[in-house]
Interface confidence: medium
C-alpha cells in the first residue's frame, strides 16, 4: 500500500508511517515501527503535558514564588500546569501572573469604582458633587453628603469631595 501523507487525529507521521501520539500526561520514549506501538511514559512529579503529543520531555510545573506575593491557586497534575494567583491584597502584574503588586488605594476625594481582584487593580473615580471620601482606601466608595434637611437641621458648612457637610440647628426667630 501507498505510504500515508496524512494521519488520523491523535496520530503523527514519521518514516512514512502513522504513529499514535502520546496522551496528555505522558511523553514520547520511542516512535512506533511496523511491528511496535508508540512507546510513552508518564510525566514525572512536578511535570506535565496538556495535549496529545510527541514531546520527548514534559514541561516543568510553574513555580508560584511566595516571595513575589504569589500563591498556588490550583496544583498542577500530570496533565495540567500549576495555576498561580496573588495573595489577598495583591494582584498580578501580567496575564502570566509571574509577580504581584499591592492593590492601589483611592486617595481622599476619590472612591472605589471597582474593587481589585487577583488579576486586576483597584479602579478609582473622583467623587462627584454631593459625594465625598475622606480616607485612602482600596475598598470604600464615595459616600453621599449627609442630608441636613431630613434631620431638621441646616447646612452650616458646605461639603467637598473630601469632606461631609456640617449640619447645625436652625436659627429660631426670637419674639
Amino acid at each position: 500500500p501507498e505510504p500515508p501523507t496524512a494521519c488520523r487525529e491523535k496520530q503523527y507521521l514519521i518514516n512514512s508511517q502513522c504513529c499514535s501520539l502520546c496522551q496528555p500526561g505522558q511523553k514520547l520514549v520511542s516512535d512506533c515501527t511496523e511491528f511496535t506501538e508508540t512507546e510513552c511514559l508518564p510525566c514525572g512529579e512536578s511535570e506535565f503535558l496538556d495535549t496529545w503529543n510527541r514531546e520527548t520531555h514534559c514541561h516543568q510545573h510553574k513555580y508560584c514564588d511566595p516571595n513575589l506575593g504569589l500563591r498556588v491557586q490550583q496544583k498542577g497534575t500530570s496533565e495540567t500546569d500549576t495555576i498561580c494567583t496573588c495573595e489577598e491584597g495583591w494582584h498580578c502584574t501580567s496575564e502570566a501572573c509571574e509577580s504581584c503588586v499591592l492593590h492601589r488605594s483611592c486617595s481622599p476625594g476619590f472612591g472605589v469604582k471597582q474593587i481589585a481582584t487577583g488579576v486586576s487593580d483597584t479602579i478609582c473615580e473622583p467623587c462627584p458633587v454631593g459625594f465625598f471620601s475622606n480616607v485612602s482606601s482600596a475598598f470604600e466608595k464615595c459616600h453621599p453628603w449627609t442630608s441636613c434637611e431630613t434631620k431638621d437641621l441646616v447646612v452650616q458648612q458646605a461639603g467637598t469631595n473630601k469632606t461631609d457637610v456640617v449640619c447645625g440647628p436652625q436659627d429660631r426667630l426670637r419674639a
Epitope: 514564588d65 511566595p66 516571595n67 506575593g69 500563591r71 498556588v72 495573595e87
Partner: antibody, heavy 121, light 106 residues
Framework: EVQLVESGGGLVQPGGSLRLSCAAS????????MSWVRQAPGKGLEWVST????????YYADSVKGRFTISRDNSKNTLYLQMNSLRAEDTAVYYC??????????????WGQGTTVTVSS | SYELTQPPSVSVSPGQTASITCSGD??????AAWYQQKPGQSPVLVIY???RRPSGIPERFSGSNSGNTATLTISGTQAMDEADYYC?????????FGGGTKLTVL
C-alpha cells in the same frame, strides 16, 4: 559544597540589640530567597523572617514585626538579621536557611548549624 | 493566622511503618514539606512539594497531602529514623511550621 554559616549570637540583656550574619557559599546566593528560623530550648521550629532574591520583599512573623529587620548583601553572599528590643522569649538557636526555589519547591533545602542567642539580665 | 497541627509523639517498632500527620485548613491546596531533626543537629529536608524526595533521602520516606491532612510515611523504619519531624507550608506570605512530632523507634 553548599554551606551556610551563622555568626553573631551571644548573651544580651533585655531591650538590647544583636546582629546575626549568615555567610553563604557553594550556590548562586542572589538567585534564592533566604530565611531565618529559630528554635527555643526544648521547643519546635518557629519561622522568623524571609527575604526575597533581590532583597525588595521582606516577610516577618508577628512575634518579631517592628523589632527585627532582615537584609542581605548579594555582593558579599551574606544574610543578616538585626534584632532590636530583645526579650527573654527571643532566646533560641537561630538558623539561616536557603529557600529551595524552583528546585525544591516551597521548602528550605539547606540549613546552617545555628547560632545561639540568649536574652537574660 | 494559619496553624499546622501534629501529634506530639508517635512510636513504631523497627521494620514497621510509621505515619506522622499534619493537619491544617485546606492544607491539600498548599504544598507541604517535612523536616527531620536529630538532637543537637540542624533540620534536614526529607520531603518537599507534598511527596518529592530530595536527593540523598532514602526511598523509605514518602509523603502525601490531600484535604486537610499531609502525611509523612516511613516504611521499614530504622533506629536511625528516631528524631523530631516537622511539617511546613506557606500561607499568606508567611512560613508556618507544625509543632513537631517525636518519632520513637521502640
Amino acid at each position: 559544597e553548599v554551606q551556610l554559616v551563622e555568626s553573631g549570637g551571644g548573651l544580651v540583656q533585655p531591650g538590647g540589640s544583636l546582629r546575626l550574619s549568615c555567610a553563604a557559599s557553594g550556590f548562586t546566593f542572589s538567585s534564592y530567597a533566604m530565611s531565618w528560623v529559630r528554635q527555643a530550648p526544648g521547643k519546635g521550629l518557629e519561622w522568623v523572617s524571609t527575604i526575597n532574591q533581590a532583597g525588595g520583599g521582606t516577610y516577618y512573623a508577628d512575634s518579631v514585626k517592628g523589632r527585627f529587620t532582615i537584609s542581605r548583601d548579594n555582593s558579599k553572599n551574606t544574610l543578616y538579621l538585626q534584632m532590636n528590643s530583645l526579650r527573654a522569649e527571643d532566646t533560641a538557636v537561630y538558623y539561616c536557611a536557603k529557600e529551595g526555589g524552583k528546585y525544591y519547591y516551597y521548602a528550605m533545602d539547606v540549613w546552617g548549624q545555628g547560632t545561639t542567642v540568649t536574652v537574660s539580665s | 493566622s494559619y496553624e499546622l497541627t501534629q501529634p506530639p509523639s508517635v512510636s513504631v517498632s523497627p521494620g514497621q511503618t510509621a505515619s506522622i500527620t499534619c493537619s491544617g485548613d485546606k492544607l491539600g491546596d498548599k504544598y507541604a514539606a517535612w523536616y527531620q531533626q536529630k538532637p543537637g543537629q540542624s533540620p534536614v529536608l526529607v520531603i518537599y512539594q507534598d511527596s518529592r524526595r530530595p536527593s540523598g533521602i532514602p526511598e523509605r520516606f514518602s509523603g502525601s497531602n490531600s484535604g486537610n491532612t499531609a502525611t509523612l510515611t516511613i516504611s521499614g523504619t530504622q533506629a536511625m529514623d528516631e528524631a523530631d519531624y516537622y511539617c511546613q507550608a506557606w500561607a499568606s506570605s508567611t512560613v508556618v511550621f507544625g509543632g513537631g512530632t517525636k518519632l520513637t523507634v521502640l
